[in-house]
Interface confidence: medium
C-alpha cells in the first residue's frame, strides 16, 4: 500500500533571467528511493539515479544544477521554460510517486513563490 | 556523426572472464550514460547494467551482480564491460548501447556487438 | 523490476499489409516506452522513442501510440525491408531498463 505524499514548491513565479529552485519532497513512507526523474511536459531534464547519481540532459547542461537534495535549479530563464513540471519519484517496495510544479517566468520583477501543497 | 565501435568476437572456456570494449565517437562522452544489452542465440534482448560516464557510477541486472563489472576510460571515450565465471549459458552477442537524453534514456546508438562463446 | 508482455510473439504479413505489435506493461510507465526494429545478424535500431516520438531518420510509416500500461506500435503499409523483429523496452525505471520478448514480423 502507498502510504507516502510529496510536498512540492507548488505555483512558483520568477523573474526572466533569474533562477529558481524545484524541490519535491517525498514523506510519510520508509520505502527507499532508487531514482528521481525531473520532467518538463514529457521531457526528460535530469535523473537521480542511487546508484548512478545525477545525469542531466545535455540540452539542459547549461541551465540546470543538480540540487539542493534531490531538486533541481533553473538557471538564466526564459520564457519558454514557463510551464508544468515533475518530480517522479520511483521508490521500493512502493513504486512511483508523482509531484507537480507549476512556473510562471515574469518579465517584471514581480516574482512571488506560491504555496506550498501536498499531493498524495 | 555518432559510433561505437565494439572489439572482435572472443572464444573463452567455462570460468574464464572476458572484456570487451566499447569506443565511442562523435559525442561529448560524458554526456551520456552506456548500458550494455546482450543476446543469446536465437532469444531476445537482455539488459545487463549501465554506467555513467560522466562519474563511473553503476547498476547492474541483479542475476549478474558479482560477476559483471562495468567501466570506463574518459580520455580515451572507451567503456568496457567484464564478465567473469564464465558459462556456457553466457553465449551471446554483447552490444553496447549509448542511452539519449532526447530520447528519453531510449537506447539511440549501438555498437556493432560482439559474440563471445563459451565452450570447453 | 517492471515486465514488459508483447503480442503476438510472431506474425505473418504480406506487403503493403497494416501491421500492429502489442506492448503491455505491468505498471504505469507514463510514455517512456521506446520501440526497436532488429534484422539478423545487425545490431537493435531505434525507431520510436517515448511512446510516440519517430526516431531522425525512420520513415513515416512507422509510427508508436499509448501511455501509461498499454502501447503499440502501427507499420501503416508495410515494406520488404521491415519483416524483422521488433522489441519494445522501457526507460521510466532505470532498475532495471527492461525489454518485451520481441514479435517477429515474417513474411506470408
Known amino acids: 500500500m502507498m502510504t507516502g505524499t510529496i510536498e512540492t514548491t507548488g505555483n512558483i513565479s520568477a523573474e526572466k533571467g533569474g533562477s529558481i529552485i524545484l524541490q519535491c519532497h517525498l514523506s510519510s513512507t520508509t520505502a527507499q528511493v532508487t531514482q528521481v526523474n525531473w520532467e518538463q511536459q514529457d521531457q526528460l531534464l535530469a535523473i537521480c539515479n542511487a546508484d548512478l547519481g545525477w545525469h542531466i540532459s545535455p540540452s539542459f547542461k547549461d541551465r540546470v544544477a543538480p540540487g539542493p537534495g534531490l531538486g533541481l535549479t533553473l538557471q538564466s530563464l526564459t520564457v519558454n521554460d514557463a510551464g508544468e513540471y515533475f518530480c517522479i519519484y520511483h521508490t521500493y517496495p512502493d513504486g512511483t510517486y508523482t509531484g507537480r510544479i507549476f512556473l510562471e517566468v515574469l518579465e517584471s520583477s514581480v516574482a512571488e513563490h506560491g504555496a506550498r501543497f501536498q499531493i498524495p | 556523426q555518432v559510433q561505437l565501435v565494439q572489439s572482435g568476437a572472443e572464444v573463452k572456456k567455462p570460468g574464464a572472464s572476458v572484456k570487451v570494449s566499447c569506443k565511442a565517437s562523435?559525442?561529448?562522452?560524458?554526456?551520456?550514460?552506456i548500458s550494455w544489452v546482450r543476446q543469446a542465440p536465437g532469444q531476445g534482448l537482455e539488459w545487463m547494467g549501465w554506467?555513467?560516464?560522466?562519474?563511473?557510477?553503476?547498476n547492474y541486472a541483479q542475476k549478474l551482480q558479482g560477476r559483471v563489472t562495468m567501466t570506463t576510460d574518459t580520455s580515451t571515450s572507451t567503456a568496457y564491460m567484464e564478465l567473469r565465471s564464465l558459462r556456457s549459458d553466457d553465449t551471446a552477442v554483447y552490444y553496447c548501447a549509448r542511452a539519449g537524453w532526447e530520447q528519453q534514456l531510449g537506447f539511440d546508438y549501438w555498437g556493432q556487438g560482439t559474440l563471445v562463446t563459451v565452450s570447453s | 523490476a517492471i515486465q514488459l508482455t508483447q503480442s503476438p510473439s510472431s506474425l505473418s504479413a504480406s506487403v503493403g499489409d497494416r501491421v500492429t505489435i502489442s506492448c503491455r506493461a505491468s505498471q504505469t510507465i507514463r510514455s517512456y516506452l521506446n520501440w526497436y526494429q532488429q534484422k539478423p545478424g545487425k545490431a537493435p535500431k531505434l525507431l520510436i522513442y517515448a511512446a510516440s516520438s519517430l526516431q531522425s531518420g525512420v520513415p513515416l510509416r512507422f509510427s508508436g501510440s499509448g501511455s501509461g500500461t498499454d502501447f503499440t506500435l502501427t507499420i501503416s503499409s508495410l515494406q520488404p525491408e521491415d519483416f524483422a523483429t521488433y522489441y519494445c523496452q522501457q526507460s521510466y525505471s532505470t532498475l532495471p531498463l527492461t525489454f518485451g520478448g520481441g514479435t517477429k514480423v515474417e513474411i506470408k
Open positions: 562523435g559525442y561529448t562522452f560524458t554526456s551520456y550514460g
Open positions: 554506467i555513467s560516464a560522466y562519474n563511473g557510477n553503476t
